[in-house]
Structure formats: structure tokens, C-alpha cells
Interface confidence: medium
Amino acid sequence: TALSPTPTTMTFTPAPLEETTTRPEFCKWPCECPQSPPRCPLGVSLITDGCECCKICAQQLGDNCTEAAICDPHRGLYCDYSGDRPRYAIGVCAQVVGVGCVLDGVRYTNGESFQPNCRYNCTCIDGTVGCTPLCLSPRPPRLWCRQPRHVRVPGQCCEQWVCDDDARRPRQTALLDTRAFAASGAVEQRYENCIAYTSPWSPCSTTCGLGISTRISNVNARCWPEQESRLCNLRPCDVDIQLHIKAGKKCLAVYQPEEATNFTLAGCVSTRTYRPKYCGVCTDNRCCIPYKSKTISVDFQCPEGPGFSRQVLWINACFCNLSCRNPNDIFADLESYPDFEEIAN
């Protein structure tokens, strides 16, 4: 077997791992690197090899991988040594699958929804349990109620609001009280003095094909900063968008395929079809990035086991400008694009 023809300085043809052979040595010490890093095809990450020596083009899905020639982490790939474990010599790049979760000693499969108690509905997503409250308490019965209490009602799961000063008339401080309840989050049961914060979404981890975008938000019941993620696909890898640029033009800002198709993820298929817009390309040095977009929820159905939902970037419009660097560089640091924040969530 050999590595795929992806441009890389680390090609090798290992002998079969038989009794007579010694294990191939993939890392050389001290490091020996070419003077200039390889040029990677669009969408292939330029990364440091597993020896922490040289820049290489990351191995892609189905490619052989070793301790040196590592799989593309920005594509959610890992080196599957299942055919060679525990030798850890040569594996094959495979897609990270959604993993199950364990909560209070009970194991749940990826995408499985369950109720650990009557107050929460939870879903297992890629090893993490996310829960939504089923007891969405309405606001206290009176906005002017100064001392509302949350009390447990016998025979009912969710607590109810009661107001000890029901007989009182509304006072001049009604507006103040309303603001206090908004801040303390009677509806969401948020903590007092919680200043809501949501960062912009990071750029997509790949310039083409399926990637991941993340942001930090504390808009949750505990007011804790948590990382949210969504899938993103700025443009397909298998379409030469340049062919769609109109004569006399240098850019195609938005590319939209003719037909609607299903999204696929880890062998699972979206329950409905979509006709997404993608960012296009330019023939000069400009690059095209989203500037109007939103996040949609896509339901996936798996051939075996339960389905699941994923947040997905939905592009409405793209902008082509000159503030681009080598597209492979955004994989390394995932800095935000300058000057542009997405207009919508």
C-alpha cells in the first residue's frame, strides 16, 4: 500500500508487516524537512506532521496514515489502526463517528434522546449530553410581585410560582421589577447579574467540503460559557466553480447547484432535501467568504440506530475581497475573518 498522491514530502511504500520485516520507521531524528512546504490542493490542510517536524499535506479519507503522515484533523478524520492495533504502525484515515454518552452510569447511543427525570429532555450528541428544560416556568403571576416563590406542588413535576403579596396593588416600581426579572431570568431560571455573551462564529475549518465552526456562549441556564458548534460547507470540493464564472467576470460570489440534494453525515442522511448556496471563487487573488448567513437545524436519519439533529451554517450571501491569505493558513489558527461578522446567527 502507499499513500495517496496528495502532494507531500512523506510518501512511503512500507513492506507488508510480516514476520520477517521490521516495522517501518516513519520519523527521522533529527528532523529532515524540504526547504519549502508542499502546496496542498484546495481544501486539504497544511499541517505539521506527527513527528512534529515538517509541514505536510494532511492525509484524507481512505488514505494510509502513520505516526508521521497524519490524518486531516480539520475534516474530523482519525487514523484507524483497527487492522493494525496495538502495533500502531499503519492505519487508514477514517471519519470520526458520533460517539455515545454516559450519564449516571447509563450509556446512550449517539443521537439518542432520553429523559433522566421529569424536568429535562436530553440528547446524546458526539459524546456530550445536552439537555433542555421541560419546566419552562411562566413569569410570576404579577410583575409587581416583590417576593415570588417557586414551590413544588404535590403530584406535579414542575414547580409553580406563588406570590405572597397577591393582595398588593401595582406600585410605581413595576418597570424596575420587570427589569429585575429579565435580568434574573425568571423564564430561563438564569443566574442574577448574568451578562449574556455570544461570540461570533469562527470561520469554517475547511475551505471546501464539510467542516466545523464554533462559538462561545453563556446563554444557558447556568450562565456558563459553553462551546457551541455547527457544521459548515463553504463550497463543494468536487465542483470546479471557476467554470461557472460568467465571461468577462473575475468572481462568482455565490454558487448554487441546480438540484436539491440530501445532506449526508457519517453514513446518515438528512430527512429532507436542501438546495444550499455556497460561496464561490475568483480567478484573481480575492477570496469569497459568507457575510449573510444563519444557523439551521438539520435532522439526520441513520440506517441503523436513531437519528439526530445538527446545527448547520446556511449561507445567504457571500462577499469576495482581497483580505485573504493562503486558504490553507486558516486551518492553523482559525482566526476570525477581518472586518466581517455574520449578520445573523
Epitope: L17, E18, E19, T21, T22, R23, E25, I70, C71, P73, G76, L77, Y78, C79, D80, Y81, S82, R85, P86, R87, Y88, A89, A94, V96, V97, G98, V99, G100, N110, G127
Partner: antibody, heavy 113, light 107 residues
Framework: EVQLVQSGAEVKKPGASVKVSCKAS????????INWVRQATGQGPEWLGW????????GNAQNFQGRVFMTWDTSKDTAYMEMSSLRSDDTAVYYC??????WGQGTLVTVSS | DIVMTQTPSSLSASVGDRVTITCRAS??????LNWYQQKPGKAPKLLIY???SLQSGVPSRFSGSRSGTDFTLTITNVQPEDFATYYC?????????FGQGTKVEIK
């Protein structure tokens, strides 16, 4: 720099369970196996099992089948090893190791009534 | 299970000596053998993998070799920091198994 940082020492009673965590940094967590190994005082190391956070698969040594439960949380780049029905001879230092090259600092688990 | 027989169980050496530790596998393990160094209260540290490949950052006075199912770790010009316990590990098949260890002490 590849680092595996394990949770602190634990003292447990016989029959109880213990859960040791192993936080990985300096590499892509889903790209490598985590192996669990234990070592009793004055003894050689003993392999417990492996897990792969990328594929979601695990494998245990035969003698620990049903007693060692390996899990992980990709959002925290952390692997966990839970051992149930503890006996006094489970007293040992428990290590996690990335593939078989980089090792955590170890977690001492003492089982005593 | 593959049994790894490590000899000797302990040895004494002086700084500057040459030390040899041997591991024998109960069946063929090709070259899938690692050597580790362990100091008291510390985790094992990988020295040699695949029988003879030196792990990054490990001094070149450590070397490994293979002859069939016999594997040798050699430390030439032993230094004060080399006094520790050494283990071999077979990574050919599950379950992964270790040798019983060799304690290298100062003479």
C-alpha cells in the same frame, strides 16, 4: 507538547467503584488510542484496555471484562476509566497512555476497608 | 497471551559501564517491542519502539536490537540518571503484555 493529565488520588472501600480521568492536550484527541495500564507497588505494569475516541470503540483485557468501563468526552478531550467491584488487590497506580508512547502521571487508587 | 520473559531482574553497574537487558517473547512478535524506563513515583517513559527505533529526545546511548524472539536493550556509557527500572512491552497482539522489569542499581 503532548500531555496527559490525570485526576488525583482516590481512596475507596471494597465493592465500590472509581472513575479516573485523563485530559489530553497537545494533539488531536480523536486521532489516537488511549490505553489504560495499572501498576501495583513493586510489580510490573498490567494492561487494562484501550479506547479510541475517533471510532468510539473500546477493548478490554480478558481479566477485566465487565469490570472496567472506558468512556470519553470529545468536547473535553478527556478519557475516563471506571472500575467497579473494587477489591484490595486493585490498589495500584493507574496510568493512561496515548497509543503506547506518551503516558499520564498516574493516579493512585487505594482500596481499603 | 504472549509472555515476555525479562532478564536479569536486577543488576548493578557503575557510571560509564555498558549495560545489557534482554527480553524473550514466548512466540513471534515480529519487531513490535518497546522499551520503557521508569523511575520511582514516575510514569514509564518510552525509550525504544519497534525494537530498535529511538524515541524523540532519548539519548543515543540507548539502543535496541532484535534476534528472532530475543530483544536486547543496551545502554552504553551509563549515566547517573540512567539508574532506574526498565520494562519491555510487546505491542504485537492483545492483550499487551510487559516483562517483569529489570532494576539497574548503582554498584
Amino acid at each position: 507538547e503532548v500531555q496527559l493529565v490525570q485526576s488525583g488520588a482516590e481512596v475507596k472501600k471494597p465493592g465500590a467503584s472509581v472513575k479516573v480521568s485523563c485530559k489530553a492536550s497537545g494533539y488531536t484527541f480523536t486521532s489516537y488510542d488511549i490505553n489504560w495500564v495499572r501498576q501495583a507497588t513493586g510489580q510490573g505494569p498490567e494492561w487494562l484496555g484501550w479506547l479510541n475516541p475517533g471510532s468510539g470503540k473500546t477493548g478490554n483485557a480478558q481479566n477485566f471484562q465487565g469490570r472496567v468501563f472506558m468512556t470519553w468526552d470529545t468536547s473535553k478531550d478527556t478519557a475516563y476509566m471506571e472500575m467497579s467491584s473494587l477489591r484490595s488487590d486493585d490498589t495500584a497506580v493507574y496510568y493512561c497512555a496515548r497509543n503506547l508512547d506518551y503516558w499520564g502521571q498516574g493516579t493512585l487508587v487505594t482500596v481499603s476497608s | 497471551d504472549i509472555v515476555m520473559t525479562q532478564t536479569p531482574s536486577s543488576l548493578s553497574a557503575s557510571v560509564g559501564d555498558r549495560v545489557t537487558i534482554t527480553c524473550r517473547a514466548s512466540q513471534s512478535i515480529s519487531s513490535y517491542l518497546n522499551w520503557y524506563q521508569q523511575k520511582p513515583g514516575k510514569a514509564p517513559k518510552l525509550l525504544i519502539y519497534a525494537a530498535s527505533s529511538l524515541q524523540s529526545g532519548v539519548p543515543s546511548r540507548f539502543s535496541g536490537s532484535r534476534s528472532g524472539t530475543d530483544f536486547t536493550l543496551t545502554i552504553t556509557n551509563v549515566q547517573p540518571e540512567d539508574f532506574a527500572t526498565y520494562y519491555c512491552l510487546q505491542a504485537y497482539d492483545f492483550p499487551i503484555t510487559f516483562g517483569q522489569g529489570t532494576k539497574v542499581e548503582i554498584k
